[in-house]
């Protein structure tokens, strides 16, 4: 039986050109976590798997970063990265847990960080 | 300088288990490394059989994860191989082979060859 | 599941400039290697990443990836070349794949 919850920032906003970390944080559950993706849409962004380390895939090496922690970093943002994206942890013995944020990137200086929420 | 050395009959009757060995000097085995199995049939292409991390935790080819078993010896120097219920299919010179993080592979033994015959 | 995808053959003049290429939708997400294999011996690593080459590898391979291909090209094909050119990747799972394999001959 899947116990777990997966905790993320949420709806975010961040400003073109700028920086944001995306973080998801998987609680209530001694399941063991294998491996976190990290997709936009159908696009694999980066995976962190607990033997393998960190891959960042190809199309986002230059836009990518690792961490902080199981997080990922998205750097110089364009418009074109509003969208959705989405942590996956699979874990064992549970199965597969997936956590959304919706980011926008946006023109202005007015970009403010939205709630947090849960996803059972 | 990695070295990796295969042994293990050459040998296998049909149904029966094979079982290699791969002897690992010139790095820890609690390294960061992972080890992993790959064969080669006559004549034919590479195929990887699957690996296991130094924390013990395996990760196998899905269309032999049924008959495959990989672990480290007892000593923590050697990488052990089963596959079980072989067929003459499984006629294949085996190599073990080791690397870190995602990719590549890069260190191979010289392989061993392994005939599944009566 | 995913497969690497190769051509069989492919021959070049000696001198002459040869591209061995790969493709996979695994390779949108993550990175090949390269290894060459010469007949009796175990197979060598020649390039990882993109073009990333280990030490004692000639200048003369080098890669290059675009959308779900990878390609590996050896400009001024030496008779030492002609061997079985293996490409390799992993999916999404960790899982590692390699390609069938191109046999390259050097004319």
């Known amino acids: 039986m899947m116990t777990g919850t997966i905790e993320t920032t949420g709806n975010i906003s961040a400003e073109k050109g700028g920086s944001i970390i995306l973080q998801c944080h998987l609680s209530s559950t001694t399941a063991q976590v294998t491996q976190v993706n990290w997709e936009q849409q159908d696009q694999l962004l980066a995976i962190c798997n607990a033997d393998l380390g960190w891959h960042i895939s190809p199309s986002f090496k230059d836009r990518v970063a690792p961490g902080p922690g199981l997080g990922l970093t998205l750097q110089s943002l364009t418009v074109n990265d509003t969208g959705e994206y989405f942590c996956i942890y699979h874990t064992y013995p549970d199965g597969t847990y997936t956590g959304r944020i919706f980011l926008e990137v946006l023109e202005s200086s007015v970009a403010e960080h939205g709630a947090r929420f849960q996803i059972p | 300088q990695v070295q990796l050395q295969e042994s293990g009959p050459g040998l296998v009757k049909p149904s029966g288990t094979l079982s290699l060995t791969c002897a690992v000097s010139g790095v820890s085995i609690r390294q960061g490394h992972w080890w992993s199995w790959v064969r080669q049939p006559p004549g034919k292409g590479l195929e990887w059989i699957g690996e296991i991390y130094q924390t013990g935790r395996t990760n196998y080819n899905p269309s032999l994860k049924s008959r495959v078993t990989i672990s480290v010896g007892k000593s923590r120097n050697h990488i052990s191989l089963k596959l079980s219920s072989v067929t003459a299919a499984d006629t294949a010179v085996y190599y073990c082979?080791?690397?870190?993080?995602?990719?590549?592979?890069?260190?191979w033994g010289q392989g061993t060859l392994v005939t599944v015959s009566s | 599941s995913y497969e690497l995808t190769q051509d069989p053959a492919v021959s070049v003049a000696l001198g002459q400039t040869v591209r061995i290429t790969c493709q996979g939708d695994?390779?949108?997400?993550?990175?090949a290697s390269w290894y060459q294999q010469k007949p009796g011996q175990a197979p060598l690593l020649v390039l990882y990443?993109?073009?990333d080459r280990p030490s004692g590898i000639p200048d003369r391979f080098s890669g290059s990836r675009s959308g779900t291909t990878a390609s590996l090209t050896i400009t001024g094909a030496q008779a030492e070349d002609e061997a079985d050119y293996y490409c390799n990747s992993r999916d999404s799972n960790g899982a590692m794949m390699f390609g069938g394999g191109t046999k390259l001959t050097v004319l």
């Open positions: 990443g993109v073009k």
């Open positions: 082979t080791t690397g870190s993080g995602w990719y590549p592979i890069d260190y």
């Open positions: 695994s390779l949108r997400g993550f990175y």
